[in-house]
């Protein structure tokens, strides 16, 4: 049976614009099966740290060790892959840091950097000084292992010089890399000595070798690409949001709900209301009113703005998010003060998430 009674019809618009809600691109940690993985929670001044995996509380067990700001996973398995978060609870607020773990056969060191320079790598030589190919910028080649989330763009670079100017070709897993070997092909920017693959997919995983050669010699360098696959998960809401707020009668207030969901999320802002002087229906369930929801006619659904508030607007506001996998919700309280009282930071009321699930 439903856990609440809706006060009014809240039929949703038939279509929602496709949006990808993501708090940030989480850092990716990659481990091979059987290895141990240690991650430090990158939050400052953490009095108490709690951990979650795919939005579910993570506690210590025979393979998971939680010591202070460190999470250790012993003997990692593919099932340990997912979206992790550590939340630092402080006296007045809390903060959450997200990261992804991918347990795969390929070890790698994170995302590639952007090619902001490049032209300077194309070195011209005095025509008399014949020279075999050589690397001109080994710093840009140090990171051999690249773990990239699916759908991202990858760039491998082999800045080189030589006289005559060397040519560059690319191999994948030791064989000639042809355009037809991947959907959408790839780009080679000879000026920048780079190979670019857009919207990488799992089949792009492998070893990529640049071969730079002229008539005086040949050099090569190999990169390893791992495409980190996402795992579908229920929506995850940033801890501490929406935050409690207070304002005077006639003031304006804003609640913010930060959502992490790869799958299309549907966001609703819900408030407990009264009907005929009662907060509960005949079935004993609370009356709830949907104030705003994501859809074609709705602007930024992650924000609920209330203008010219009255005392009747005081109460609990719930941010409820759903995707095709599951739901999550958190709530905050609005305190409306009489006009003569200036609003202060809420301390007395602490929002405990009103999980309907």
């Amino acid at each position: 049976r439903p856990s609440f009674s809706l006060v009014e019809d809240t039929t949703l618009e038939p279509e929602e614009p496709p949006t990808k809600y993501q708090i940030s691109q989480p850092e990716v940690y990659v481990a091979a099966p059987g290895e141990s993985l240690e991650v430090r929670c990158l939050l400052k001044d953490a009095a108490v740290i709690s951990w979650t995996k795919d939005g579910v509380h993570l506690g210590p067990n025979n393979r998971t060790v939680l010591i202070g700001e460190y999470l250790q996973i012993k003997g990692a398995t593919p099932r340990d892959s997912g979206l992790y978060a550590c939340t630092a609870s402080r006296t007045v607020d809390s903060e959450t840091w997200y990261f992804m773990v991918n347990v795969t056969d390929a070890i790698s060191s994170g995302d590639d950097e952007d090619d902001t320079d490049g032209a300077e790598d194309f070195v011209s030589e005095n025509s008399n000084n014949k020279r075999a190919p050589y690397w001109t910028n080994t710093e840009k080649m140090e990171k051999r292992l690249h773990a990239v989330p699916a759908a991202n763009t990858v760039k491998f670079r082999c800045p080189a010089g030589g006289n005559p100017m060397p040519t560059m070709r690319w191999l994948k897993n030791g064989k000639e890399f042809k355009q037809e070997h991947r959907i959408g092909g790839y780009k080679v920017r000879n000026q920048h000595w780079s190979l670019i693959m857009e919207s990488v997919v799992p089949s792009d995983k492998g070893n990529y070798t640049c071969v730079v050669e002229n008539e005086y010699g040949s050099i090569n360098h190999t990169y390893h690409l791992d495409v980190v696959e996402r795992s579908p998960h229920r929506p995850i809401l940033q801890a501490g949001l929406p935050a409690n707020a207070s304002t005077v009668v006639g003031g304006d207030v804003e609640f913010v709900c930060k959502v992490y969901s790869d799958a299309q999320p549907h966001i609703q802002w819900i408030k407990h209301v009264e009907k005929n002087g009662s907060k509960y229906g005949p079935d004993g369930l609370p009356y709830l009113k949907v104030l705003k929801h994501s859809g074609i006619n709705s602007s930024n659904a992650e924000v609920l703005a209330l203008f010219n508030v009255t005392e009747a607007d005081a109460g609990e506001y719930i941010c409820k998010v759903s995707n095709y996998i599951g739901q999550a919700n958190q709530s905050a309280w609005l305190t409306v003060l009489p006009k003569q009282q200036a609003p202060g930071r809420e301390k007395e009321i602490t929002a405990s998430p009103d999980y309907l699930e």
């Epitope: 038939p14 759908a151 997919v201 095709y324 739901q327 699930e357």
Partner: antibody, heavy 112, light 106 residues
Framework: QVQLVQSGAEVKKPGSSVKVSCKAS????????MHWVRQAPGQGLEWMGA????????DYSQKFQGRVTITADESTSTAYMELSSLRSEDTAVYYC?????WGQGTLVTVSS | EIVLTQSPATLSLSPGERATLSCRAS?????MYWYQQKPGQAPRPWIY???NRATGIPARFSGSGSGTDYTLTISSLEPEDFAVYYC?????????FGQGTKLEIK
């Protein structure tokens, strides 16, 4: 491991109702939507609706609104799909699905 | 509602060949999902979030695309790959499927 076990085949008369059950095990039943999808003989797949057992939220395809009722019993980890005012074109295999796992399907035949 | 159109309806190829299945949406979706179905069996989730293989799906399968155009590619067909493949969108209710592409042995 995750399992979704559906009730057996049904033969129904036009105008009547059918209620198909789907018993879940191997995961937290209340934390995931249970979807219902049907497939007429030799045809494609059609999403009908879903329920979130944790709070009994439902989401229906407009095509079936008013004729389909999806419910869930958390105590037995079972979801139900009831389709009323049956007609011959409702003859199909009905599947329950937790996004990454599907039941084996229940054949409902509507015939006079 | 978002209409998904799969092409071709039937694809006749031999083992070892490359297969390219297309799915076009009537309006933009953020991700595409693919299922494989064999006769007498329930559909099996195959690719999720456009390009991620479901557990146990071989690396010869890859998904790509964005907006309204999506593709499922099988780099080198194995005998067990011959089946019907459906695309699906989870972007807006009703969550529609394509009509399916039947991949058959030539």
């Amino acid at each position: 491991q995750v399992q979704l076990v559906q009730s057996g085949a049904e033969v129904k008369k036009p105008g009547s109702s059918v209620k198909v059950s789907c018993k879940a095990s191997g995961y937290t039943f209340s934390s995931y939507w249970m979807h219902w999808v049907r497939q007429a003989p030799g045809q494609g797949l059609e999403w009908m609706g879903a329920i979130y057992p944790g709070n009994s939220d439902t989401d229906y395809s407009q095509k079936f609104q008013g004729r389909v009722t999806i419910t869930a019993d958390e105590s037995t980890s079972t979801a139900y799909m009831e389709l009323s005012s049956l007609r011959s074109e409702d003859t199909a295999v009905y599947y329950c699905s937790k996004f990454d796992y599907w039941g084996q399907g229940t054949l409902v035949t509507v015939s006079s | 509602e978002i209409v998904l159109t799969q092409s071709p309806a039937t694809l006749s190829l031999s083992p070892g060949e490359r297969a390219t299945l297309s799915c076009r949406a009537s309006s933009s979706v953020n991700y595409m999902y693919w299922y494989q179905q064999k006769p007498g069996q329930a559909p099996r989730p195959w690719i999720y979030l456009t390009s991620n293989r479901a557990t146990g799906i071989p690396a010869r399968f890859s998904g790509s695309g964005s907006g309204t155009d999506y593709t499922l590619t099988i780099s080198s067909l194995e005998p067990e790959d011959f089946a019907v493949y459906y695309c699906q969108q989870w972007s807006s209710n009703p969550y529609t499927f394509g009509q399916g592409t039947k991949l058959e042995i030539k």
